[in-house]
């Protein structure tokens, strides 16, 4: 047969669906790999073919579209499960072809079991909301296309295992869940269960969003260097170990890149001949403010090392900060080298 453009296994699309729930999966070819959409391809005489490889098997096999109640069907560029079964897990391939052209891509589909409290191996999207902000809304995700707009599904929201009824600052409004003046105690997994009828059957869609309450933009600041500071002097004798922590506080800023680095006499540690070790640790507050500590250490400090200028630098999207460490040789009356 003719050569086929094989895009391989698209592991970027790790599709997870819950067992015993409907699932609609679009062929990724038209979303990520080809410049035209399904309608254009179809009107050009191209056919979309589906097949799959079961979990822990190597054999590709056609998908059985003749199951009872049309459990698996194809509609345009969508593969439908009404509903999924655990053993539907595997790698699915969609192939677009005619007599002269062929393009295909595979993607993994995992059917996941959940317990009565919605606990599962499913990876949930994270929604960050600002603390004390007025109103935040989250919307039940990935339910578009499952039922026509004429159908009004019932929606029930849960926090963890508890149905959201009379929560003081969390209000269910159909597909939306509103948070009024959120606090850290609003952190958690929020699940919407959407129930809709189709051909005399009731189907359930379960979707979970992890809510994380973070620091507000109004509280965002440039980095604050706690250490080194002007109050602490690092007084050492030659041969002793010199340890200077650079401890920096970064308020939470969405998508900010927080940096901390040392310079020695204006150069990066890698560019000086001193035998320096730098260890970094990071801790987070409840609102994802970050404290980043870089410890600079010299095992056996020399008189020359004790005359160098050690400066801690920090940067985020709000600005920069720097602070020199006060280093001196024990017995010396000043930080400047003595001239005899």
């Amino acid at each position: 047969s003719e050569r086929c453009d094989d895009w391989g296994l698209d592991t970027m699309r790790q599709i997870q669906v819950f067992e015993d729930e409907p699932a609609r999966i679009k062929c990724p070819l038209f979303e990520h790999f080809l410049k035209y959409n399904y309608s254009t391809a179809h009107s050009s005489g191209l056919t979309l073919i589906w097949y799959w490889t079961r979990q822990d098997r190597d054999l590709e096999e056609p998908i059985n579209f003749r199951l009872p109640e049309n459990r698996i069907s194809k509609e345009k560029d969508v593969l439908w499960f009404r509903p999924t079964l655990l053993n539907d897990t595997g790698n699915y391939t969609c192939m677009l072809r005619n007599t002269t052209y062929c393009s295909k891509v595979a993607f993994p589909l995992e059917v996941v079991q959940k317990d009565s409290c919605f606990n599962s191996a499913m990876r949930f999207p994270v929604h960050k909301m600002y603390i004390e902000h007025g109103i935040h809304k989250i919307t039940c995700p990935n339910v578009d296309g499952y039922f026509p707009s004429s159908v009004k599904p019932s929606v029930t929201w849960y926090k963890g295992c508890t149905e959201i009824v009379d929560f003081h600052n969390v209000l269910p409004e159909g597909m939306n869940l509103s948070f009024f003046i959120p606090l850290v105690s609003n952190n958690g997994n929020y699940t919407c269960v959407v129930t809709y009828p189709e051909n005399g059957r009731l189907f359930h869609l379960t979707r979970t969003v992890t809510v994380k309450v973070v620091g507000s933009p109004k509280d965002a600041l440039p980095p604050q260097i706690y250490s080194p500071n002007d109050r602490v002097v690092y007084e050492k004798e030659p041969g002793e170990e010199l340890v200077i922590p650079c401890k920096v506080y970064f308020s939470f800023i969405m998508d900010s890149h927080n940096e901390v680095w040392w310079t020695i006499d204006g150069k990066k540690p890698d560019d000086v001949t001193v035998d320096i070790t730098i260890n970094e640790s990071v801790s987070y507050s409840s609102t994802e403010d970050e404290t980043r500590t870089q410890i600079l250490s010299i095992k056996k400090v020399t008189p020359e090392d004790l005359r160098r200028n050690y400066v801690c630098h920090a940067r985020n999207t709000k600005g920069e900060a720097e602070q020199a460490a006060k280093v001196k040789q024990k017995g010396n009356g000043c930080t400047e080298p003595m001239t005899l």
């Epitope: 603390i131 004390e132 902000h133 007025g134 109103i135 003081h168 600052n169 009024f180 003046i181 606090l183 850290v184 105690s185 507000s216 109004k218 409840s286 609102t287």
Partner: antibody, heavy 118, light 107 residues
């Protein structure tokens, strides 16, 4: 210096209305959530209502929900509490208080007395 | 709603002595607990926030401890100006709730 100054209290008949104001100064008013807390004569403190720094989010104690409305005007550095359908049990000193999640109610006004009586 | 229970209702202490006030929450409030002092005819004043951090200008004789459901305010050596009513308040969950107060009086 942070200052919160309540006004608008007084004697009102049951079923009547009153509007309290709280004038803020000495800080960036628009950066803080604001609250009303009340204290009935000889009793403890009761949180009444909160409004977010941007004015969009409001919350109320069940005892006043549907009767009281909190609002703010950040351009005037002023917090308001519109109280309708007042009852005898709403008699209290009403305090406005500044709130930050990190520091709780760190500043309070001196209070204004609301008396609901026929 | 989280119920805050303070004990004792009244504490009789001599000046210079230590006073220990308790506050219990009906469910965990993490460390989101504050203590306030109120004198007759005055507004409450913040003493402690975050269960253990002293507010600006509060003397070191005031200290707070605890997390979760059990909290303590300690006044190490009572001064004459410390005789007042003390309230705990949780700000972990809406609605925010106060304890009923502990009155510290002169013995």
């Amino acid at each position: 210096e942070v200052q919160l100054l309540e006004s608008g209290g007084g004697l009102v008949q049951p079923g009547g209305s009153l509007r309290l104001s709280c004038a803020a100064s000495g800080f960036t008013f628009a950066e803080y959530a604001m609250n009303w807390v009340r204290q009935a004569p000889g009793k403890g403190l009761e949180w009444v209502s909160a409004i977010s720094y941007d004015g969009e989010g409001t919350l109320y104690a069940d005892s006043v929900k549907g009767r009281f409305t909190i609002s703010r005007d950040n351009s005037k550095n002023t917090l308001y509490l519109q109280m309708n359908s007042l009852r005898a049990e709403d008699t209290a000193v009403y305090y406005c208080a500044r709130f930050r999640y990190y520091t709780a109610f760190d500043y309070w006004g001196q209070g204004t007395l609301v008396t609901v009586s026929s | 709603e989280i119920v805050m229970t303070q004990s004792p209702a009244t504490l009789s202490v001599s000046p210079g002595e230590r006073a220990t006030l308790s506050c219990r929450a009906s469910q965990s409030v993490s460390s989101n607990l504050a203590w306030y002092q109120q004198k007759p005819g005055q507004a409450p004043r913040l003493l402690i926030y975050g269960a253990s951090t002293r507010a600006t200008g509060i003397p070191a004789r005031f200290s707070g401890s605890g997390s979760g459901t059990e909290f303590t305010l300690t006044i190490s050596s009572l001064q004459s100006e410390d005789f007042a009513v003390y309230y705990c308040q949780q700000y972990n969950n809406w609605p925010w709730t106060f304890g009923q107060g502990t009155k510290v009086e002169i013995k």
